[in-house]
């Protein structure tokens, strides 16, 4: 795409964008921020949705992994004409509805929400936004907030998962470009490799899952390694160790040669899963090997 760091994680990414009247003269900066960030998530298993809010929330692009649809969605995003109030809660509701209904092959995909706003939310609107963000979290989402210009950081820390999930942009909209790298680093949860990738049939093993962002979980005690065996049975295992760039997990005992286990990771005790193209296969090992 445009070079530089990228994210290979397979999850659902929601952009919830303020298009209220106060961003009227800054929509281009918001668009270019989203466009550049979107191009850095490159897993074929990553799905993306664009949601805009003002006096109501609208799904501009429903959840899709189709890169052509994402390109068209970005074109639609560029055409948005801001105006109206800052009903951020409406944006979260649109995201939650998709999280709730758009599961993949019978399991819920992990969801990351990046919500951007430029103003302070007054009284009821803050209460509503916090409540709807909590409901998104109840469905397994990780919530990040980007605050530009006249935002209230204390409010955004309560809407986001924590203060660490807030990206303040104090120097105005033109400074949005400067946080792309840090947002990418923080919001990316990816599985890159498993060591060993081949294990002996019928024997117990430990697997090192290499990746990034495993400590982004709200509670690292809720991180699970998940093995989808031969596209049917899924076994979840609690890791022995959770570090940001690797997990140490017990591998399930796979009795037969040629069995395949696709690796997934849950950050929330199995409520939802980050997918990958990493596969562990079994082979025949002779005694003493």
């Amino acid at each position: 795409e445009d070079g530089g760091p990228a994210c290979y994680g397979g999850f659902d990414l929601y952009f919830i964008l303020d298009k209220s009247g106060s961003v009227l003269h800054h929509w281009n900066e918001i668009y270019y921020f989203v466009e550049q960030l979107a191009h850095k998530f490159i897993s074929p298993q990553l799905r993306m949705s664009f949601i805009v809010f003002s006096t109501r929330g609208t799904t501009l692009m429903k959840l899709t992994e189709d890169r052509e649809q994402i390109r068209q969605g970005l074109e639609e995003l560029q055409k948005v004409l801001p105006g109206g109030d800052t009903y951020m809660h409406e944006g979260f509701e649109r995201a939650s509805e998709q999280i709730y209904y758009e599961n993949r092959q019978g399991y819920r995909t992990a969801s990351v929400i990046i919500a951007l706003t430029d103003g302070e939310l007054h009284e009821d609107l803050f209460f509503y936004s916090e409540r709807e963000a909590n409901r998104s979290r109840d469905l397994g989402a990780i919530v990040y907030c980007v605050g530009v210009k006249d935002f209230n950081e204390t409010q955004l820390a309560r809407i986001a998962d924590s203060k660490d999930h807030v990206f303040p942009v104090n120097d105005g909209f033109q400074a949005l470009q400067g946080i792309i790298h840090s947002i990418l680093k923080k919001s990316c949860i990816e599985i890159l490799a498993a060591e060993p990738s081949t294990i002996c049939a019928g024997e117990s093993f430990q697997v090192v899952v290499r990746g990034n962002g495993f400590r982004h979980a709200r509670n690292v005690d809720r991180v699970l390694c998940s093995f989808k065996i031969n596209d049917s049975v899924t076994l979840n295992e609690k890791p022995f160790s959770v570090e940001d760039t690797y997990l140490l997990c017990p591998a399930p005992i796979l009795k037969e040669v040629g069995m395949k286990a696709a690796l997934q990771v849950s950050m929330n005790d199995g409520l939802s899963f980050i997918s990958s193209s990493v596969i562990i296969t079994t082979t025949h090992c002779s005694d003493g090997s």
């Epitope: 609208t58 799904t59 429903k62 959840l63 899709t64 809660h89 509701e93 649109r94 939650s96 509805e97 998709q98 709730y100 209904y101 758009e102 599961n103 509503y128 409540r131 709807e132 409901r135 109840d138 469905l139």
Partner: antibody, heavy 115, light 108 residues
Framework: QVQLVESGGGLVQPGGSLRLSCAAS????????MSWVRQAPGKGLEWVSL???????YYADSVKGRFTISRDNSKNTLYLQMNSLRAEDTAVYYC?????????WGQGTLVTVSS | DIELTQPPSVSVAPGQTARISCSGD??????VSWYQQKPGQAPVLVIY???NRPSGIPERFSGSNSGNTATLTISGTQAEDEADYYC???????????FGGGTKLTVL
Amino acid sequence: QVQLVESGGGLVQPGGSLRLSCAASGFTFNSYAMSWVRQAPGKGLEWVSLISSGSSTYYADSVKGRFTISRDNSKNTLYLQMNSLRAEDTAVYYCARAGFKFDNWGQGTLVTVSS
Amino acid sequence: DIELTQPPSVSVAPGQTARISCSGDSIPNYSVSWYQQKPGQAPVLVIYADSNRPSGIPERFSGSNSGNTATLTISGTQAEDEADYYCQSYDNTSPDLVFGGGTKLTVL
């Protein structure tokens, strides 16, 4: 403005089949989940089925395996194929734009299952 | 599955405040909507996400959700508010949309 118009209701014998349609206009149909809700004579509302914008489908236990919801985004139309109909399926069937709420409803179409 | 319980009927004098309750386990975790249905008509959404009013719905309609009960409040009830009212929510564990049994509001 948003408009939902149901059709296809009528009298059918127990064990028979019927296909309901709902023509939608006034909104971006393919971006919304859509649902069927029914109301038996003199009774309350009962959710029947939902199809998400990405075409994932969900059903109430009472109709699972008998009813099939589908959508044709090119025609802005929602469908409900009802098979193995029973007397207790007699109701007015409403098509509704859905999510966590049903924010727009059609006027309904009456399905009567009787011999 | 989540079950929503409503009183079958509520009566109120014109100009007074009517309160219709909807109870269910863990209801505050879920978004509650309310619908008004008049005889022979389709339901109309009057409150969504616990307390939000769609455009065109009079300000006398309000909603709240706390404890194990969601409440629809109609302040200064008018004769035209006489109708059946249904609460509705969803089940977090499996995609299932649920309605309460309905409450008949009579304006005396």
